[in-house]
């Protein structure tokens, strides 16, 4: 008896991070023997969708004409051949941006920083959130991912960098999200350009461990002063 059918490949075009209202196409590629393709979405009744293969039968297209919250989530696909159903594909995480208003990103004490010194990037959201993502332009993955440990919602997250090196220079944005769906992100913040100056010999960049994220001093504008001090966001390096 032949072994299990090879798992198909699942991907999204133009990508897996899609702005609200934009179109996205999910592709599932199996083998030429495929007769039918099935797409499952986690926590949705299976199958989420079924499609006949496109010629030459080795792949199927699942179209989302306008991205909304309902489409965000984790997908897997399968194909059926004359001998049965394949193994599931690796998961595809379809993320929607634009679910919430954009946070604001600041560099403290300044976006102009001398090599070897410290800087903290501060991401502040309009409504309380429990997850904050810091993205560096042209980096493959989120640089930092801060998540509340106890579901405590915060209006801000701090991303300390120390000691700063030339590697830290570049353009950053941040996103915020709610714990009930990490597939729904805010609009991106306006970009922040971090400029590292100085010719000190660059030590190897290392993240600091501090994760202070309580609402700030009493004068902090339009932020709640009653949030639990240092309830903490857990840092994930990715």
């Amino acid at each position: 008896q032949a072994g299990p059918l090879p798992k198909p490949t699942l991907w999204a075009e133009p990508g897996s991070v899609i702005s609200w209202g934009n179109s996205v196409t999910i592709w599932c590629q199996g083998t030429l023997e495929a007769r039918e393709y099935r797409l499952d979405k986690e926590e949705s009744p299976a199958p989420w969708d079924r499609q006949n293969p496109l010629e030459p039968k080795n792949k199927a297209r699942f179209s989302i004409p306008s991205m909304t919250e309902d489409y965000a989530g984790r997908y897997r696909c399968y194909y059926r051949s004359p001998v049965g159903w394949s193994q599931p594909s690796d998961p595809l995480e379809l993320v929607m941006t634009g679910a919430y208003s954009k946070p604001t990103l600041s560099a403290l004490p300044s976006p102009l920083v001398t090599s070897g010194k410290s800087v903290t990037l501060l991401c502040q959201s309009r409504s309380p959130m429990d997850t904050f993502l810091l993205i560096k332009e042209r980096a493959a993955h989120p640089l930092l991912h801060l998540r509340s440990e106890h579901g405590a919602q915060q209006h801000q997250a701090e991303f300390p960098m120390s000691p700063v090196t030339s590697v830290h220079g570049g353009t950053y944005r941040c996103f915020s999200s709610h714990g009930f769906s990490h597939y729904l992100l805010s609009h991106p913040s306006d970009p922040l350009e971090l400029i590292v100056s100085g010719s000190l010999e660059d030590p190897r960049p290392s993240p600091t461990r501090s994760v202070s994220t309580a609402a700030g001093p009493e004068d902090q504008p339009l932020m709640p002063t009653g949030s639990v001090p240092h309830s903490g966001l857990r840092r994930h390096w990715e």
């Epitope: 609200w20 209202g21 909304t68 919250e69 929607m96 634009g98 679910a99 919430y100 208003s101 954009k102 946070p103 604001t104 600041s106 403290l108 004490p109 300044s110 501060l122 502040q124 309009r126 409504s127 801000q156 729904l184 805010s186 700030g216 001093p217 004068d219 902090q220 504008p221 339009l222 932020m223």
Partner: antibody, heavy 117, light 113 residues
Framework: EVQLQQSGPELVKPGASVKISCKAS????????IDWVKQSPGKSLEWIGY????????SYNQKFKGKATLTVDKSSSTVNMQLNSLTSEDSAVYYC??????????WGQGTTLTVSS | DIVMSQSPSSLAVSVGEKVTMSCKSS????????????LAWYQQKPGQSPKLLIY???TRESGVPDRFAGSGSGTDFTLTISSVKAEDLAVYYC?????????FGAGTKLELK
């Protein structure tokens, strides 16, 4: 395209109540605060209050507490403002506006309210 | 409540002229937490709703021409139009979003000479 479409002009008698609506489209409705702003004839802008469609949270300018009540209908992506015990002082253009970070990036076209006997 | 004062109340200008208008707040709008000034500027043309021009005192909203520039910090702010066009004739309002209730200035009306 983000749009906030407000209901049409209202002519009401003193002492009556009125409900004006603001239908949002072109964005993720539940994730953005909607505020209301009053502009009396020839005057500046006064902030009335906000509602957060996701959970119905509201906050009001002390001046408009008891005068304005904000509600949301998520199924139709609509925010409503009811104004009660109307007097001539309430005659104005009322705007709904989408909050970005406490400032307003999109505004409705305005609803003119005239209170007259 | 934070009081916003704008001056002048009206301004007669010629097309091509450089224009500055002032907005003062009764308390500082500069946050110690993020070093940002919680001030926005709006443009309102006759019969239209306000339109966001500037936020964080100096960040231009997407699509706003670069002849509009915001500056200032703390309690004193300025909106500058480097070369006025006929389409810029409008009332300009500043708004503080440092604390509730949100408050607006009385506006500066830009008119043709």
């Amino acid at each position: 395209e983000v749009q906030l479409q407000q209901s049409g002009p209202e002519l009401v008698k003193p002492g009556a109540s009125v409900k004006i609506s603001c239908k949002a489209s072109g964005y993720s409705f539940t994730g953005f605060y909607i505020d209301w702003v009053k502009q009396s004839p020839g005057k500046s802008l006064e902030w009335i209050g906000y509602i957060f469609p996701s959970n119905g949270e509201t906050s009001y300018n002390q001046k408009f507490k008891g005068k304005a009540t904000l509600t949301v209908d998520k199924s139709s992506s609509t925010v409503n403002m009811q104004l009660n015990s109307l007097t001539s002082e309430d005659s104005a253009v009322y705007y709904c506006a989408r909050q970005a970070f406490y400032y307003f990036d999109y505004w409705g076209q305005g609803t003119t309210l005239t209170v007259s006997s | 409540d934070i009081v916003m004062s704008q001056s002048p109340s009206s301004l007669a200008v010629s097309v091509g002229e450089k224009v500055t208008m002032s907005c003062k707040s009764s308390q500082s709008l500069l946050s110690s937490s993020n070093q940002k000034n919680y001030l926005a500027w709006y443009q309102q043309k006759p019969g239209q709703s306000p339109k966001l021009l500037i936020y964080w005192a100096s960040t231009r909203e997407s699509g706003v021409p670069d002849r509009f520039a915001g500056s200032g910090s703390g309690t004193d702010f300025t909106l500058t139009i480097s070369s006025v066009k006929a389409e810029d004739l409008a009332v300009y309002y500043c708004q503080q979003y440092y604390s509730y209730p949100l408050t607006f200035g009385a506006g500066t009306k830009l008119e043709l000479k």
